[in-house]
Structure formats: C-alpha cells, structure tokens
Interface confidence: medium
C-alpha cells in the first residue's frame, strides 16, 4: 500500500531578521521519503539543513521533518521538496511567522 504524505510548512522566529522554516511530512507509507529545502529551485547543501528521524506516528504510517534558517523577507525563494513512492511536489513558505520551539 502507498499512503502519500501530508506536507506542512511553518515558520518560527529565531532572532531579529532570521527565521527557521520547518517542513513536516506526516501520515505517509512506506517510510522511504526525500524531504529537502530548495533555494531558487536548487537543493540546499546538507550543512545548512537539519533533519528529524523518520518515526512511526502510531497509525501505521510515518512522520519526519526538515528545517533550515533563512533571512526574513526571502521566503519566496524557498520551497520544500518532497519525493515519496514516485510522487513529488514542492511546497512554498507561507510567510506567516509562528512562535514555535525551534528544532535548532
């Protein structure tokens, strides 16, 4: 069976002028997934991103996340790229900044 992920992008304020954008994929199966941030359509290098483990979410499906820091005002240059079971998609940064606990 294949269950496509639900992808959600959120922003959290880190410090003045900088924000952390987090891309979360949830409720997907099987567990193999590619989740990465792109800037100007190009994947960011690994040293500028942080990934969460792919974990079971208790419903027989999985969840994970990837985060990166960006400068406020440049949100439109960033998208979260997801690839899962032959399907892929890009998800833009909304621009809404939420006050969330940072993964960094």
């Amino acid at each position: 069976r294949t269950v496509p992920p639900m992808v959600n992008v959120t922003c959290s304020e880190v410090s003045e002028g900088n924000i952390t954008v987090t891309c979360r994929a949830s409720s997907f199966y099987p567990r193999n997934i590619t989740l990465t941030w792109r800037q100007d359509g190009v994947s960011l290098s690994h040293n500028t991103q942080q990934w969460g483990d792919v974990l079971p979410d208790g419903n027989g499906t999985y969840q994970t996340w990837v985060a990166t820091r960006i400068r406020q005002g440049e949100e439109q240059r960033f998208t979260c790229y997801m690839e899962h079971s032959g399907n892929h998609g890009t998800h833009p940064v909304s621009g809404k900044v939420l006050v969330l606990q940072s993964h960094w």
Partner: antibody, heavy 121, light 112 residues
C-alpha cells in the same frame, strides 16, 4: 569532461536582437542551475541572469531586466539568452556558467569560453 | 545592491614571494545558516574565469594549496603563500548572498 560552448554572438545595431545559446555536455544539465555572466572589453565581470534547474526561478540584473530573457531546454542540454533592445553598453563577452552555490561545494564552477556580442551602428 | 571593493587594483609580485588581496562588501555576507557567501575567481590572460575559493575559505577542487581565503562578514582576504608565474591574471571577489550577485573590480597580479 564538462563542456559549455556558447554561440550566437556577433555584431548588431543598437535596438537590435540576438539569441545566445550554450550547449552543455559531460554532466547532468537538468540538475544544474545556470547563470550568464558578461565582461565588457577591458572591464570586470558582471552577473546578468540566473535560471534554476527546472526553470521555475529566474532572476535578472537591473541593467537587463525587461530586455533580456533567460531560458533552458533540458531535453536539448541547452541554455539560452534572448537579448532585445540592445544598447552599446551591452557590448561584452557573454559567459555561460553552472551555478551550484547551494548544493555541494561550488558557486560557478564551470564556465564556457564566451561569445562576443558587439552593439554598434 | 551589495557593493564589492578590492585593493590593491594592481599587484606586482616577485616569484616565490607571498601576495595578499583584500576585498570588502557593503553588507555582511554571513548568512543565518552560518555560511559566508564570498567567492574568489581568477581570470588568466585570454581565458575564462575559474573558481579558486568558495564560501570565503574553502579551496575549490584542483586549486593549489598555496591559495587560501579568510575573513569576516564584510572584510575578506585572498592569500598566495608563494606566487608562481602561472598565477598572473585578474583576481575577482564576488558576493553570492543575494541578487544581484556582484563582483569586485578585480586585482591584476603581475610578475615583477
């Protein structure tokens, strides 16, 4: 080995048009962002335009915005620069370059040999 | 736009001697991801430019280790520990932080 070969340069009158091409080989072209950089005779380097691997992100220098159009054909491993309303100050050698500043190690790590565009009446 | 300046604009050097080129940016090139988006290129006479240093201090593949890059957010230095005849050409710094990408005016290194 990696090769970028520009073509399409030449002499054109002010107000005229030219289309530059860059043929890429030796690497997976569709994975690379590309940029055009130009160099006026005896002068320094000037970034002109950027296009992402899928063509969904495009940027231009203010000096060419509205006159130049960058595009790519991944099936043909080719990059293009359509130049309209040319001015004398557009006279330069135009270089096609790969652009990998986000991914891996480099920024502009491969450059073509350049093609000369001369705008003169 | 971010303005890049370089000094000196001309640099005569004796082979075997060290050389140093300075580059400054009008705005910090340190990104919040902790990378500094400053690059050095060399354009040898009659050739296309080639990359020397990426992200301020990383030596590009195939570049001799006599080249090194250092700096802070707005002030950068390219050093050649021992200049060789093949090092002649124009050295450019470039900011790759934001559009439009901008280059310094170039420093012409020549052999005395």
């Amino acid at each position: 080995q990696v090769q970028l070969v520009e073509s399409g340069g030449g002499l054109v009158k002010p107000g005229g048009s030219l289309r530059l091409s860059c043929a890429a080989s030796g690497f997976t072209f569709s994975n690379y962002a590309m940029s055009w950089i130009r160099q006026a005779p005896g002068k320094g380097l000037e970034w002109v335009s950027y296009i992402s691997p899928g063509g969904d992100y495009i940027y231009y220098a203010d000096s060419v915005k509205g006159r130049f159009t960058i595009s790519r054909d991944n099936a043909k491993n080719s990059l293009y620069l359509q130049m309209n309303s040319l001015r004398a100050e557009d006279t330069a050698v135009y270089y096609c370059t790969t652009d990998r500043r986000h991914y891996g190690s480099y920024a502009m790590d491969y450059w073509g040999q350049g093609t000369l565009v001369t705008v003169s009446s | 736009d971010i303005v890049m300046t370089q000094s000196p604009l001309s640099l005569p050097v004796t082979p075997g001697e060290p050389a140093s080129i300075s580059c400054r940016s009008s705005k910090s090139l340190l990104h919040s991801n902790l990378n500094t988006y400053l690059y050095w290129f060399l354009q040898k006479p009659g050739q296309s430019p080639q990359i020397l240093i990426y992200r301020m201090s990383n030596l590009a593949s195939g570049v001799p280790d006599r080249f090194s890059g250092s700096g802070s957010g707005t002030a950068f230095t390219l050093k050649i520990s021992r200049v060789e005849a093949e090092d002649v050409g124009v050295y450019y710094c470039m900011q790759h932080l934001e559009y439009p990408f901008t280059f310094g005016p170039g420093t012409k290194l020549e052999i005395k």
